[in-house]
Amino acid sequence: KSPIFGPEEVNSVEGNSVSITCYYPPTSVNRHTRKYWCRQGARGGCITLISSEGYVSSKYAGRANLTNFPENGTFVVNIAQLSQDDSGRYKCGLGINSRGLSFDVSLEVSQGPGLLNDTKVYTVDLGRTVTINCPFKTENAQKRKSLYKQIGLYPVLVIDSSGYVNPNYTGRIRLDIQGTGQLLFSVVINQLRLSDAGQYLCQAGDDSNSNKKNADLQVLKPEPELVYEDLRGSVTFHCALGPEVANVAKFLCRQSSGENCDVVVNTLGKRAPAFEGRILLNPQDKDGSFSVVITGLRKEDAGRYLCGAHSDGQLQEGSPIQAWQLFVNEESTIPRSPTVVKGVAGGSVAVLCPYNRKESKSIKYWCLWEGAQNGRCPLLVDSEGWVKAQYEGRLSLLEEPGNGTFTVILNQLTSRDAGFYWCLTNGDTLWRTTVEIKIIEGEPNLKVPGNVTAVLGETLKVPCHFPCKFSSYEKYWCKWNNTGCQALPSQDEGPSKAFVNCDENSRLVSLTLNLVTRADEGWYWCGVKQGHFYGETAAVYVAVEERKAAGSRDVSLAKADAAPDEKVLDSGFREIENKAIQDPRLFAEEKAVADTRDQADGSRASVDSGSSEEQGGSSR
């Protein structure tokens, strides 16, 4: 007895598609062995039509695919544009066709369900609109026009020209009689339901001279598109529902039990709490299409998703829909990285961002997720030397440690910095990851003066006090600029006296600027690192002024603010609004993030739309 299992019989209609799932025991060998779909011949052989190794028979070219889902122990054969020639006996199996690890499937493709002569077949997707055309002769032009549905043996009136509408169709059907020149009336049914499928009869006149036309309406429930993404990665759902619903509220929902479909996000501003910080709904195009990006995929995100359009912003009977079945691969290529990073007010965080190591030359970005409207993610910094104006001096994106990870350092933290941030590149869009920054109680570990003023031509010494917990770390000073932080020479001045309960392992490391020039003005950071992994940093702004009195300046900690004042964005700060910068390439298959700059405030394009692992901010 074969352990392979599937449907023993599949019945369909010409022109339609089938999706055949075959189950196998998910042993290591089975998961990786060849999967095939073959047609049984009269003399016992089985001719391969498609296999997991890329073979596709000419009979199936352009209309079939085979997808393996090793996690589930299934593979799926999709066959489109069925014809009666496809009827026959098939096998789905593993290994070699003749070896017996297979399951017999009978596929029967019929012309259509018992169609009467002269029957017009209408095949329409669930939730869409159908127009049934009914011709008539001149003698029936003034007579009653009607549409009936065959229920069992009896025709039931659906609509007629005297104004009757069957209650099952209220609000979604109309009967149009064309101008006098055209001997035709049509019945338009919107928001099609599965229950609308069946045989219809349209009629002009009621006597023996009436004109009749048969119609067969097939309402197709969309087969879910199978999507297979990595744990911790990202997925993009592209939803194209057609221009007829361009002005209707859109939604993405996830099917739970039964017929329930819980809204994940919609254009009316609803968003499920589980997706906070990791979802964006891209504003729709004129044709009503939109896309939804979800990052930081979790095991529990797997399931069936529907996108649709309905004024309520949620699934209702008759909503046009598209469906996906999302599988989340736990054998992920995306490495674990902290999903929560903690820092203290006045302190700093160093965030590690994974990217596809095959794309080391891609541009790296970091953006701040904003939940307003449908979610948006304005860029804050990139690896090409651009930093959003409000973050100058306190934000840096470093290519280190490299080989699939870059680092983002943010210091001078305030409570306003708490939130969700996305790491992304202009390469593989599946590698978008999310990190939440939390601001917790506490004091910064590194102690530096507040703002410092240097005098032209003189020497300036700026101290940085490192507590003993960083005794094994490399300590450095650097000068911040848009492209990073250039290391500077510094002097170890021995143990620091700035810490209570801290032994000889605490350190005072000073930055010395000799013969200060105007070019020395700017932001300086002191920090700790271990190899290419960065820990805490502290920032000091050095202003340069004309000489007032001779001598060198040695800045002491006493003159420093214990923690920098919280910076409040001035009222002139202008958000990048949805309408300001739109770049659909930032979703899905984008290859480059738009290099749009807003001269007014140095803003840049944004990734726009209308139980965590945790990491402290102090070290790797």
Epitope: F5, V13, V18, L194, L220
Partner: nanobody
């Protein structure tokens, strides 16, 4: 969820036939995958047959032990699923349960965990 009521069970001689019916309430019955399971005294519930319709195509599944003898079918207009049982054997004696699996039917149709609505069951006894 849908409510399910089975009927058609009874006592039959080996080699005989029975037709079980399962009537479902719920507007969107047609979008559910429907299955039949059985449970003999002292044994685990086992998969018998399943059927799934997506508006255009029908998929039928059955267990090896009933292949060629039992046929599952559905009538969406009547919200009913049937199990035609021919060539019955004494080992077919069990309580037969109808079950409904909400869309999508991507999960294994043989797994009872993928069904969220169950009937009360109807008893089939096959005497030798």
């Amino acid at each position: 969820q849908v409510q399910l009521v089975e009927s058609g069970g009874g006592l039959v001689q080996a080699g005989g036939s029975l037709r079980l019916s399962c009537a479902a309430s719920g507007r969107t019955f047609s979008s559910y995958a429907m299955g039949w399971f059985r449970q003999a005294p002292g044994k685990e519930r086992e998969f018998v047959a399943a059927i799934h319709w997506n508006g255009a195509s029908t998929y039928r599944y059955s267990a090896d032990s009933v292949k060629g003898r039992f046929t599952i079918s559905r009538d969406n207009a009547k919200n009913t699923v049937y199990l035609q049982m021919n060539s019955l054997k004494p080992e077919d004696t069990a309580a037969y349960y109808c079950a409904a699996s909400p869309p999508p039917t991507v999960g294994d149709v043989r797994d009872p965990a993928n069904y969220d609505s169950w009937g009360q069951g109807t008893l089939v006894t096959v005497s030798s």
